[in-house]
Structures are given as C-alpha cells and as structure tokens.
Interface confidence: low
C-alpha cells in the first residue's frame, strides 16, 4: 500500500472533506517542481515567484538578480535564455502554440553589460526556433522554414538555407510527424560543443499526403488547416542532414552527411544527432521497417571540408523480436575518449540495459543486468555514470537514481535515492550541473513531490529546493483515496496494477469499478507518483474504485511483455484489461454490475475495443479522442508496431483491429465517444468513422465533440469534458447527483 500524506487523528475526522470536482478543475492541489537552469558546475538560474531571473552560486551561497521582472514585463516575456558568455539574454514573448512541442514566438535580445535591448538587425517575427551557440553568443534561428545565423546579436544575419517553404521544405525544424513521433522536439538543429559547426536536418514533405480539417473560428467561413501527415503506408518525408562551418559559413556552405548504405537502400528515418567533439558527430538512422537502427560516427575531413562516415564506425542495432529500442531508439552517451559510448539496449535476456560500446555492438560490455530495466543515462563523468532504473525492490513503476563508478575496477554500484525518503519518494528524475559537480533530485511521489540539491561527489543533500509545504497543508483536511500498487500473475504474465480506493474503503462492501486505460506500446500507467486528479475525486467523493493496469505492450518489464503486441495492436492490451477486471471481481469488493472503462487517445482505442469485446463485463465506457483504425494514424508510430498496411505485410491485422469492425458489439453497453474537431494528432476522422459504423449498425451511443480543440482538449473544454464524463459515469453507476 502506498502511503499518502499523514492523516489527522480520528477525533478530527469529521473536519475532513472529500475532494470535489471543482478542486480538480481549479488545480487546487497541483504541485511544484524545481529544475535548476544550470549555467556552470556550481551555478544555476531560476525564475523567482515574482519573475526576476536570479543566478545562484552553490559554493559561495550568493545569489543575485541578472534580469529584473521589470525588463521581463517590458516585452511581456514568458521565457528567457542566457548566452554562454553571459553578455546577452534572449526574451521570448507572444508565445503561439503549434503542435505538441512547436510554437512560434517573438524574440528580443537584451544586452546585460549595457542594460539595454540590442537594436538594429533585429530578429524577424514570429521565429520558429532560436538558440545560442554553446560557447560565446552566436545565434541560430529558424524563420519561415529557413535557418539564419548571427555571429553576434547585433550583426546582420547570414542566411544558411534558401529552400524553406511552408508545408513543403522544413530546415532546422521538424515536420509534423518527425516532431511528434521521432525527435520529440521543436528543433532539428544542433550546435557542435564549441560552436564551430551547426548541424541541421532538412525535411522534404513535397510528396506527403495532406490531412485537411476545418477550423471554425469566429469568421463567416471556416479556415482549412492543411498538414502534410503521412498515415500508415503513405509516402514519408525525405530527410537530409547538413553541417555548416559557422566561422566561415560562406566558404564551402552546408555539407551533407552521407547516409549509411544499408539504410539508404530503402525508405528510412533520421532519428537523432549527437555531437561528440567539434569535429566528430554521431548520427542515428532507422529503416522504415523499424527493427534496424544504425549509429554512424562521422569525422570532419579538413582537407576536403567534408564529413566522412566510415563503415567501421557504423554500429547496427537490430531487433529480432520487435522494433528497435523502446518507444524511441536510445541515444548514445559518449565517454571522454570521444569514440566509445554508453547506450541502453536489450540484453540477451530481453531487458533494456546499459552497454559500453568500444569497437562493435557485438563486443559491447554490459554495464547493468537483471530482470529490470535501465531507463535513462543522465551523465557520464571521468569516474561515474549516473542512471535511473526500476531495479529497487522489483517495482517496475518506480525510478531510482544510481551511480556506477567507472573509474575503478570492478565498477561499484550505489543507489543514490533508494533510502533518502523511502516512503515519500520512489519515483525520481535528476538534473546535473557541468561535470556532475552538483545535481538536483526531483521526486514525483508517491508522497508529495520534493526537489532537493545534492553534492555530486558525496551525494550529500545540500538543501531543499521545493517541498510543496502549501500543498501539504492544504491536503491536511482532505480525505484522499488510498492507493495500492500490486501485481497479478496470469498465464506467465505479470500484470501490475494501481488501485485507487475510497477513503473509507471496506472490503466487505461492493463498489463500482472504473478502469482507466492507456495501454500504448512502451507506455506505463502504474507508477509510484503523486497525483490529485479526476480519478482521485471519483474515489474520494463518488466512492468508486479506480484501477490502472499495465498489460502486454507496456514498458520497463522486459521485451517479452513489451514486444508481445508487435504487429498485433488491439489484441493483448484489451485481453489483459479484461483479465484484470475478472481478477478484481474475484477479490470480492467489486459490484460486477457496475464496471466501466475509460481512456484517452490510445486508451480510447483500448477502451472502445474492451467495450466491444462481447464479454458482458462492462456496463459503460468512454473513449476520448480514440484511434479507430491504424490506417488513420501516423506512419512513424503505427508502422513501428504494426508493419505496413499492405497485403504482403500486415494489412489483415490493420483491418481486423479497427473499432468499426466491432460496431455490433456496442449494442449492450453505454458508450460515450468524445473528440476535438481540430485534433492534428488523432484526427477527428477516427471518431467520425466510429460514429458512422454505429449508426449503420443502428446502435445507440452518446457523443460529444469539442469544436476547434486539439488532442489535449485544453482550457474551458477540460472543465466541460470532466463534468460531462462525471455525469455519464454517475448515471451509469446509478449514483445520485
């Protein structure tokens, strides 16, 4: 049982109240984290509560404001970035969201030494991406899909690319599918460590089919949004990588980095770029059939002014059991010799672990091992490697930070976080200063989150950065639900689940059950994290039991579970939710006539299929922005797990796994279907097709659309959405309003 913040004595129990839906919608019980913006080994910046930008020196204990809130306010800045030479700050305003990571903004450069904004040769607007060089104060930015370079903020810009064109050619920024499904960033350019070179990607979307949808707005006629969006099996973007010498950009111009021959022989993706030194770069490539990844280390040839990627420096990662990597192919962390590196990939037992690659992948030295997974390599120094894993006490939904001494032999391993605040903190991430001199630990739960600062040599805690005292006080009179994280063993499969129980839970009584599902490949829902959210309210106030189950296809428990869904999406994820429900019924406290399931996105797909499974287990359910057919979703994501929708590949399962194919089976359940009409990710088309199939089958259902809302259903739509879903569930479970 996961412990929550301490309860008051029973005598005071009558002063405690349940959570309300309003609490959730107002974000009353949201928590804060503290991530230092490191600028050296011992200094970091932080935006204070009153919006001053403050520099902290850990060793001297001093702090001073480098940029006042007055300056920030003068341009309505919502973000900032200090140049590495500390002479300038860019200020970001007029933030305008595009897709998940991308946004445009207006940028102003403030000269700290002169205390004024840099004028003349100002930046165009809106800018799609802007960043400082890692050394000095060069600026690279993307405007109207082209890349520009400034040697100094006040200098005129040098235009690096000229072929950028909206929805056609993207330079230095990803197109939709690369942003969402491959890079997970708003940028596609990378400075070399000392700023000598700038690498960038060019994406050619000329031949990609376009998704078009109406944006209703306030005008007489709706706008049409057009996005080059490759659905499964469609033509993909063509990617090229270039590198330009930023010292003499006009000298030879951008030089293309060659693609490995084994990759270039068929459709492929670029997956990431990692600079090793100023004259060595590492590129990762992936075949369109995403079970072969090639890591290519390339060197600058001074004599030819070109980049050479010898075959001897190509490292191949191939999966025989699924796709390459986890959600993404992992990226390398290079060691100080600038050729060997550390990387997470599957070991022979099918668990993702850290390996040290010196010459070939085949000769990789395994650094971690066991029936658990290494999840992230945070930092490699001369003598230590810091990483996170879910090893401790065999709970896959935990994250602890470990240090391996790589300077000594044999290497010794130490868990930095396992025993710090054992009950409160079981799920950590970390942020390291230069050379890992200091680091911040951010604990996400299961107790109230806390952020702390530590010495990188001794691991000693220096100070608490954020402990959420106000939140702790606010929760003192709240009857929070109880949470359990346990596992079911079914047919050699371990199903971890989180159960959220009403505050006065009594095992001898019967409760309605709501399954919350995501279930997408390489996801994890059962995590030891703190949350006060909608399902907390449903348990606290409405007396429901809520369960989250990680079935086949979910992450961090080995390849057998992860790759079980390969080429068969929509089968085992659903089976495992159903299996878990049956086990929950056997526990004796579930009212089997009042069971519901709900999910969003992939979870909407799974919940729909579960409702249409014909088991009779579910009385009702909700699908928010569901995928309804894998033929409608993005190529990069879908094909990773499903292969191609062609007859000689996997078309049959693409057809068999649609929600529409099961329309008849919705007849005996209450179904609420919800979607935003401006969903750029899971297109409204998905729900439109479900609705059409249900109408054609003459099956009654409920639906709600959110006009001009995307996949996140944010703002006022959020309030409406959760209110609407609450009413639906209360009606389904015969709970009085």
């Amino acid at each position: 049982i996961v412990l929550r913040p301490s309860r008051v004595h029973n005598s005071e129990e009558n002063t405690m109240r349940a959570l309300t839906l309003k609490d959730i919608l107002n974000g009353t019980f949201s928590y804060k984290t503290f991530f230092p913006n490191w600028i050296s080994g011992q200094e970091y910046l932080h935006q204070s509560a009153d919006n001053n930008i403050v520099l902290y020196n850990i060793e001297t204990g001093q702090s001073y404001t480098i940029l006042s809130n007055r300056t920030m306010k003068s341009v309505n800045a919502s973000n900032y970035g200090l140049s590495p030479d500390r002479q300038f700050v860019y200020l970001e305003s007029d933030y305008s969201k595009l897709w998940r990571y991308s946004y445009t903004a207006t940028y102003y450069i403030y000269d700290l030494s002169n205390g004024e904004f840099v004028r003349g040769n100002e930046l165009p607007r809106p800018i799609q991406y802007l960043c400082w060089s890692p050394v000095g104060s060069k600026l690279a930015y993307v405007y109207q899909n082209n890349i520009y370079l400034k040697q100094r903020p006040g200098d005129p810009p040098f235009q690096i690319t000229f072929n950028g064109r909206e929805n056609k050619i993207f330079n230095g920024i990803p197109d939709w599918v690369y942003e969402e499904e491959m890079l997970a960033t708003k940028y596609a350019l990378w400075w070399s460590p000392n700023g000598k070179f700038l690498a960038y990607a060019e994406f050619n979307d000329t031949d990609i089919p376009v998704i078009a949808y109406s944006y209703y707005g306030d005008e007489q006629y709706p706008r049409t949004i057009n996005i080059p969006y490759p659905k499964a099996g469609a033509k993909n973007p063509v990617v090229r990588i270039f590198i330009i010498d930023t010292t003499y950009p006009a000298y030879v111009g951008p030089q293309e980095v060659p693609v490995p021959a084994m990759i270039a022989s068929s459709d492929y993706y670029f997956s990431w770029l990692t600079w090793v030194t100023d004259e060595r770069v590492c590129l990762q490539w992936l075949k369109r059939v995403q079970n072969v990844s090639v890591l290519s280390i390339c060197d600058f040839r001074e004599d030819w002014q070109t980049w050479d990627c010898p075959k001897t420096q190509e490292h191949i990662e191939e999966s025989r059991t699924g796709w390459a990597g986890g959600f993404f192919v992992s990226t390398p962390v290079f060691s100080y010799d600038a050729i060997s590196y550390y990387k997470i990939f599957s070991d022979k037992d099918g668990y993702k672990h850290i390996h040290y690659i010196k010459d070939t992948v085949e000769n990789a030295i395994q650094i971690t091992s066991g029936k658990w997974e290494a999840i992230n390599i945070f930092r490699v120094t001369q003598d230590s490697l810091f990483y996170s894993s879910n090893e401790f006490e065999e709970y896959p939904g935990r994250r602890n930070i470990y240090r391996i001494s790589i300077g000594s032999y044999p290497p010794s391993k130490k868990c930095v976080t396992c025993h710090l605040r054992k009950e409160r903190c079981q799920y950590y991430t970390a942020s390291f200063s230069d050379y890992a001199k200091y680091y911040a630990l951010v604990c996400y739960g299961p107790g109230i989150p806390i952020s702390t600062l530590h010495d990188g040599r001794t691991d000693q805690e220096i100070k608490i950065l954020e402990e959420n005292k106000e939140l702790e006080n606010a929760l003192k009179n709240i009857q929070l639900p109880k949470e359990e994280i346990k596992k079911l063993e079914v047919d050699e499969i371990t199903l971890w689940y989180k159960m959220i129980l009403p505050p006065q839970f009594d095992r001898s009584k019967k409760y309605p059950l709501l399954i919350q599902v995501y279930g997408g490949p390489c996801s994890q829902s059962v995590r030891s994290v703190f949350a006060v959210n909608w399902i907390s309210y449903l348990a606290s106030k409405e007396g429901m039991v809520i369960a989250l189950v990680d079935g086949r296809g979910t992450a961090f428990q080995g390849d057998k579970l992860l790759y079980a869904v390969y080429r068969k999406l929509g089968v085992y994820e659903v089976e495992d939710q159903i299996t878990a429900v049956r086990k929950f019924i056997e526990m004796g406290f579930i009212d089997e006539k009042r069971i519901a399931i709900w999910g969003w996105s992939y979870g909407g797909y799974v919940s729909s299929l579960a409702l249409a499974s014909g088991t009779g287990l579910f009385k009702c359910g909700i699908a928010v922005a569901p995928v309804s057919s894998w033929e409608y979703y993005a190529s990069v994501y879908t094909e990773r797990f499903m292969g191609l929708p062609t007859k000689d590949d996997n078309l049959e399962h693409y057809k068999n796994s649609t929600v529409m194919a099961r329309a008849e089976y919705f007849r005996n359940v209450d179904y609420l279907l919800i979607h935003g009409t401006a969903d750029d990710n899971v297109h409204f088309q998905n729900s439109a097709q479900i609705a059409k199939a249900l109408v054609n089958a003459q099956v009654d259902f409920q639906a709600m659309w959110y006009s001009d809302q995307n996949h996140g259903l944010s703002g006022l739509s959020t309030n409406h959405l959760y209110t609407h879903m609450t009413h639906f569930l209360k009606q389904c479970f015969s709970l009085s309003d």
């Epitope: 021959a261 059939v289 072969v292 025989r320 037992d349 790759y563 996997n650």
Partner: antibody
Framework: EVQLLESGGGLVQPGGSLRLSCAAS????????MSWVRQAPGKCLEWVSF????????YYADSVKGRFTISRDNSKNTLYLQMNSLRAEDTAVYYC???????????????WGQGTTVTVSS | DIQMTQSPSSLSASVGDRVTITCRAS??????LNWYQQKPGKAPKLLIY???TLQSGVPSRFSGSGSGTDFTLTISSLQPEDFATYYC?????????FGCGTKVEIK
Amino acid sequence: EVQLLESGGGLVQPGGSLRLSCAASGFTFSSRGMSWVRQAPGKCLEWVSFISSSGTYVYYADSVKGRFTISRDNSKNTLYLQMNSLRAEDTAVYYCARDLPRTGVYFGMDVWGQGTTVTVSS
Amino acid sequence: DIQMTQSPSSLSASVGDRVTITCRASQSIFNYLNWYQQKPGKAPKLLIYGASTLQSGVPSRFSGSGSGTDFTLTISSLQPEDFATYYCQESYSTPYTFGCGTKVEIK
C-alpha cells in the same frame, strides 16, 4: 523454384583455406538473411554463421570466430564462406540456408541447400 | 551460450503412434525455438518456428508447444515418411544452438 546450391568443398590440409559458395535462385536473395550450418559425420547440426540481408550484420559461432568470414554478393545472388586456418574438427558437410522473411519476428532456416563436403586431413 | 538438450536421443514407434519429443534450454528462450526434420543424406527441413508456428507446407500432424525452457514436438499419428531425426534449435541468441537430435525409428 527456390534453390540453394553450395559449391567449393573438397579435401584440404590442416591450416589451409577454402572458399564455399552458395548460389541462390527463385527468390529475392537481397531481402533474406542467410546462414551456414555444418554437420560432422554422424554428429549433430552446428550453426556456423549468419549474415543479414544487406550484409552488414554478421554473427559467428565461437568455434569459427576469427577464422571464417561470411559474405554475400547480392548482385550475384551468392553467399560465401571463406574458411582459413582449417582444422580437422572443421570436417563436415556445410549447408547454406535461408532465413525466414525479415518482416517476421523469428529466426529460422526455411530453405536449405543439399550441402558440400569439406574434409580437413593431412 | 545456451545449451539445448533433447530427449530421448532415439525412440522406436509404429505407424499411427503419437510421438512426443522434448527439448530443454539451459535458460529461458521464451518461444524462440525451431524444430527441424532430417532424413539420412538429406538437408534438414524446417517444421516449426516460434515454438508453435507450423511452417507452410508441413502436415498438421506436427505440432509444437512450450515456452521458457521446456518444449515439445508432437507427431499426432506417425506416418511412414516421418521416420527421421528431429532437431530443436534455439533462435533467441547467437550462437543459435541445436539439440543433438532425436532419431525416430520403426519399431
């Protein structure tokens, strides 16, 4: 008809070299991984080496590592096994075999040649 | 390396008999197991891959089962053409080790 035809076997002295070839026909050679498997007289099967369809991913059994080299020429639809520093224990029938389609999950050898005999003896 | 142990090493059976051959891996190989049939002087033939998937063209009297370390090949009704040596092979990690075979002889 799918066919694999090995050649290049024969009698060789210990320490000598041989190059085996396997000519493939009836399928798209460049889209399949290929293996060499051997069987000493009256003994079990022993997997020797594997090469991926593009020729860049290669595995060897420990017993031959450093002495044998697998390669392929997709333009000639031919698989090779260069065998150096041969030993008496390398005496066997050598089969070339085709891997299951690369779109599948499993490794397995679905088509085999008739084998070529290598005898290492002084 | 993973070791593969087959049992029995030989067996005698009559036409129409149900025959079961077992194969044990020294560590879990999940379902990464293949079964081959070899007749004297001939190349092996793939019967089953992935522990239980019948290779196309193989008669349905052959079936495979098992997962982890223990696997079984079953011939539901032995036919005259089934007298041969049967090999298991792990396909989980290189070197893809074979078992040493089970010879099925006429009783």
